[in-house]
Interface confidence: low
Amino acid sequence: YDFTNCDFEKIKAAYLSTISKDLITYMSGTKSTEFNNTVSCSNRPHCLTEIQSLTFNPTAGCASLAKEMFAMKTKAALAIWCPGYSETQINATQAMKKRRKRKVTTNKCLEQVSQLQGLWRRFNRPLLKQQ
């Protein structure tokens, strides 16, 4: 999916009002310095691409993020503010339902959510242009 035409301000508002707090809740008890950020993004569409991938694509050691509160709110925000996004996700959602597993917060998941926090921060702070 091409995130270029999303309403970035509305997505940012959704992040600020709820998603960020759900991420913090998920990470509660974890030191902010515990994980190094290894995933980055260069602009807002790129950030959303990386955020979608980390949030919804199961990875080795962490298969359960898609049903977390922050993930559901992320999905809702993208569906509302990114034209055509929800249509592209129907097949992916069906597949996800089939392989849903018991919820386990592993260290790998914590690391992944830490990466997500970094991506969201970058999404919320595009660098100012040098003048």
């Epitope: 301000e9 508002a13 600020l16 707090k21 991420l23 913090i24 919320n124 702070r125 100012l128 003048q131």
Partner: antibody, heavy 121, light 105 residues
Framework: EVQLVQSGAEVKKPGASVKVSCKAS????????MNWVRQAPGQRLEWMGI????????SYNQKFKGRVTITRDTSASTAYMELSSLRSEDTAVYYC??????????????WGQGTTVTVSS | EIVLTQSPATLSLSPGERATLSCRAS?????MHWYQQKPGQAPRPWIY???NLASGVPARFSGSGSGTDYTLTISRLEPEDFAVYYC????????FGGGTKVEIK
Amino acid sequence: EVQLVQSGAEVKKPGASVKVSCKASGYTFTDDYMNWVRQAPGQRLEWMGIISPYNGGTSYNQKFKGRVTITRDTSASTAYMELSSLRSEDTAVYYCAREDYDYDGYAMDHWGQGTTVTVSS
Amino acid sequence: EIVLTQSPATLSLSPGERATLSCRASSSVSYMHWYQQKPGQAPRPWIYATSNLASGVPARFSGSGSGTDYTLTISRLEPEDFAVYYCQQWSSNRTFGGGTKVEIK
């Protein structure tokens, strides 16, 4: 603990320039924006401009464009605001304010103590 | 530039009363921040992103609003609440409102 320490009070003549410094400590200087905001006696807060210490990018309030220059020295974790062609109405307290980009959402979460600039002939 | 208009300019109330401060934007903004300032002091962040209280801010404060209309409410004024409150937006550069002074009646 995040701290922003500004340079001392200045008295300048009309037409002169002033350069105010803001030394940051307690966080990674290049991680957050730095704003400059001023407040004339009894007046509202007035945003002047902002810098990304990470890459030196700036954005200014059009009202000050051409008169204000915001720079930074990353090795010293210090931001600077220079205002030129001073006039009496530039008499104000000048604040630097760190702007966090995390879940607080671009808010100016830490402020310097303020630098009083008096413009008088 | 987005202009923020705060009303009233001055609010004269007694401790224990409810205070309602308004901030209206000339164009729609995503959210609003509020700052408290006392004489001779730098502003302090008070409410982040429309409704999130800054650290140490008492629960008697609340923020609400969307689009062009935002409100800061103090349910029961305490002596330490008397100060000037400024709203600030980021949707288009950064601008502050003119401030509302909450003074003791």
